[in-house]
């Protein structure tokens, strides 16, 4: 019995369906098939699951979150002994085995491995405004989403006609800040934060208004 | 304690219908397929229906097919069968069991809790 | 479906005798063989899975051996507690099948 080499790791965006492949060859009749979907999960490593099982002509569900969302892509018994997951979650991501047993065929190797990842779009960020907005300031613009996978990368723009940040400024794209030194009355206008993964963008918008001193009365 | 309890046996006419409950208690009933096997009167035992644990997998012997329908209800630790057209050959003690997975030959599985039974008598 | 024959349907021993009870599979089913005791008027009990596990707190006087068709359970020195029916069951394909029995009664 000879499982197939697997592509290595599958992504999919969180909600959508993930397909892991398993295939193998065997010299036997399908007679025998027994088949253990596990997980590693990449956030409790120490805690194998059972995801489903096929024994005896039999489906087993696993462990109690993957109950109504697996499934074999296939009808069983087959030597292609993929599985779907549905409606994935973030917890889902992990190290997926299928170990097939075929009795008599003994031998060869009997595991296949696919890494899974489950890809979330940037959630909402807020942004905010770090310090003073009186002229000749520094300031901090602050720009963060909760979720997302991969870690989103920050982008601030201005909205006016040319988009640039004011001279003064320099930006930190994977922490989402814009630092403006010496802020001046040109600093002022409408800011906006874009969030981006591999699988999605989110904005948020903040208005900068710089306070100039107010004339002395004699 | 690891408990099986079923209930709602009795007396049915031929063509009559039935429903039989399991309580479960003592273990977490919904990570569990659960079966329905049945013993004639001085006679052996016969595998009846399957539920997986979710639902999702169903079977049944070839003889109820059409007729039986299991189901379970995971809030309530609760397993059914809901027996239609009943025959005089489905006269018998119904049995709740419980399903496990072991690890041998790679995986098996084996009726491993059984409950005391409920009769069914169909007669007219 | 897979038949299991028993053999034989019931024998009569005596305390402290061995006793072998045959089970023959119409087909091969790879160990995936269990067996069950049951006292009348109660639910059957498992003593074996696989061939030849003992389940947990089933007396060690109980083994099971055999392959592809035929299958044996001995209970090496027949205890009073042990007269029952004892019954195979295949968990190799569906439908789960039975054998019909085998009594143990008291010589």
């Known amino acids: 019995l000879e499982v197939s080499e697997s592509p290595g790791s599958v992504q999919v965006a969180r909600g959508q369906t993930a397909v892991l492949p398993c295939a193998f060859s065997t010299s036997a009749a399908l007679l025998n098939l027994n088949v253990i979907w596990m997980v590693i999960p990449l956030s409790n490593a120490n805690q194998p699951e059972q995801v489903i099982l096929y024994q005896g002509g039999q489906m087993f569900d696993g462990a109690l979150r993957f109950h109504g969302r697996v499934g074999f892509t296939g009808t069983m018994p087959a030597t292609n002994v993929s599985i779907f997951i549905n409606n994935t979650q973030l917890s889902d991501t992990g190290t997926y085995q299928c170990l097939v047993n075929n009795l008599p065929d003994r031998g060869g190797r009997n595991i296949g491995v696919t890494g899974l990842t489950v890809l979330v779009p940037p959630s909402a960020p807020q942004c905010q405004i770090q310090g003073s907005q009186d002229l000749g300031s520094d300031v901090i613009l602050l720009c963060s989403s909760e979720e997302g996978i991969p870690r989103p990368t920050y982008l601030w723009e201005k909205l006016d006609n040319t988009l640039k940040l004011p001279p003064t400024a320099t930006q930190d794209q994977v922490q989402g800040t814009v630092t403006i030194r010496n802020i001046s009355a040109l600093s002022s206008g409408l800011y906006q934060c874009v969030a981006s993964n591999a699988i999605g963008t989110s904005t948020c918008l903040l208005d900068l208004q710089v306070i100039s001193p107010q004339p002395r009365s004699v | 304690e690891v408990q099986l309890v079923e209930s709602g046996g009795g007396l049915v006419k031929p063509g009559g219908s039935l429903r039989l409950s399991c309580a479960a208690s003592g273990f977490t009933f919904s990570s569990y397929s659960m079966n329905w096997v049945r013993q004639a009167p001085g006679k052996g035992l016969e595998w009846v229906s399957s539920?997986?644990?979710?639902?999702?997998?169903?079977y049944y012997a070839d003889s109820v097919k059409g007729r039986f329908t299991i189901s379970r209800d995971n809030a309530k630790n609760s397993l059914y069968l809901q027996m239609n057209s009943l025959r005089a050959e489905d006269t018998a003690v119904y049995y709740c069991v419980r399903s496990i997975i072991v690890q041998a030959l790679g995986i098996t599985s084996v009726f491993d809790i059984w409950g005391q039974g409920t009769m069914v008598t169909v007669s007219s | 479906a897979i038949r299991l024959t028993q053999s034989p349907s019931s024998l009569s021993a005596s305390v402290g005798d061995r006793v072998t009870i045959s089970c023959r599979a119409s087909?091969?089913?790879?160990?995936?063989l269990n067996w069950y005791q049951q006292k009348p008027g109660k639910a059957p009990k498992l003593l074996i899975y696989a061939a030849s596990r003992l389940q947990t707190g089933v007396p060690s006087r109980f083994s099971g051996s055999g392959s592809e068709t035929d299958y044996t359970l001995t209970i090496s020195s027949l205890q009073p507690e042990d007269f029952a029916t004892y019954y195979c069951?295949?968990?190799?394909?569906?439908?789960?099948?039975f054998g019909h029995g085998t009594k143990v009664e008291i010589k």
């Open positions: 069951q295949q968990s190799y394909s569906n439908p789960r099948t």
């Open positions: 087909q091969i089913i790879s160990n995936h």
């Open positions: 539920i997986s644990s979710s639902s999702s997998y169903i």
